[in-house]
């Protein structure tokens, strides 16, 4: 489990509790209600939903 | 290890059905898009369908050129999904592979299997 | 529906030189943030594999001879320097929309 604070993850990537791993935070544009999107600084608004 | 198992294919005649299934295994299945993706040489890559969450209640998308003849199912306690194909055309000859994506990318496909309609 | 365009075709390159791929999208795959082109290493009797997502992000495992750039509509795929393993054909692909849509692929093959 990851400390509060802390991110093992590069620029551009959150980390997901739900898949134990970093995820991009590009993905946050179709899928902006996964766990990890609320690590991204701002997830880009999507010009419609895919 | 992430493994997508392939299963179904071979001959069939025009007008024929055909199912396809893929096992899933080494990730989080229940979060990922299930998706199929065939390859022929006269179309190239070609992605024919994609099938959501349950959280979603399993919404499909289909392309144009099978939409109503092609359904695509995914059983996530068996980590399966699933391509029922009808009313199969020559056209629709070719490599089908199962793809997992979790938004964009493909980062893991089947192995293939092969399709073949012809009289 | 987005039309990617590849060029070339196919592409003859000598060990250890730089090999450059072009993808064209019909419309803008990008946002201000991201842009929404992944690249694919396919050999024969194999499935595509992934290697670069979101342009110019190498897939983990990918060795860093392998690089992605652009936005908008025009991207690229460099392979520097080229090595005999890297015999394949390359696809794009976007994300932008469903449905998601292809290259026809460029043949990279060594001289």
């Known amino acids: 489990e990851q400390a509060p604070g802390t991110s093992p993850c590069s620029r551009g990537s959150s980390w997901s509790a739900d898949l134990d791993k970093c995820m991009d935070c590009a993905s946050c544009r179709a899928r902006p209600h996964s766990d990890f999107c609320l690590g991204c600084a701002a997830a880009p608004p999507a010009p419609f939903r895919l | 290890e992430v493994k997508l198992q392939q299963s179904g294919g071979g001959l069939v005649q025009p007008g024929g059905s055909m199912k396809l299934s893929c096992v899933a295994s080494g990730f989080t299945f229940s979060y990922y898009w299930m998706n199929w993706v065939r390859q022929s040489p006269e179309q190239g890559l070609e992605w024919i369908a994609e099938?959501?969450?349950?959280?979603?209640?399993?919404?499909?998308h289909y392309a144009e050129s099978v939409k109503g003849r092609f359904t695509i199912s995914r059983d996530d306690s068996k980590n399966s999904v699933y391509l029922q194909m009808n009313n199969l055309r020559p056209e629709d000859t070719g490599i089908y592979y199962c793809a997992c994506r979790y938004a964009d990318y493909f980062d893991h496909w089947g192995q293939g299997t092969t399709l073949t309609v012809s009289s | 529906d987005t039309v990617l365009t590849q060029s070339p075709a196919s592409l003859v390159v000598s060990l250890g030189q730089r090999a450059t791929i072009s993808c064209r999208a019909s419309?803008?795959?990008?946002?201000?943030?991201?842009?929404?082109i992944h690249w694919y290493q396919q050999k024969p009797g194999q499935p595509p594999k992934f290697l670069i997502k979101?342009?110019?992000n190498r897939d983990s495992g990918v060795p860093a001879r392998f690089s992605g750039s652009g936005s908008g509509t025009d991207f690229t795929l460099n392979i520097h320097p080229v090595e005999e393993d890297d015999t394949a054909i390359y696809y794009c692909q976007h994300s932008w929309e469903i449905p998601p849509t292809f290259g026809a692929g460029t043949k990279l093959e060594l001289q």
């Open positions: 419309q803008s795959v990008s946002t201000s943030d991201y842009s929404y």
């Open positions: 979101y342009a110019s």
């Open positions: 099938i959501r969450l349950q959280s979603n209640d399993y919404p499909t």
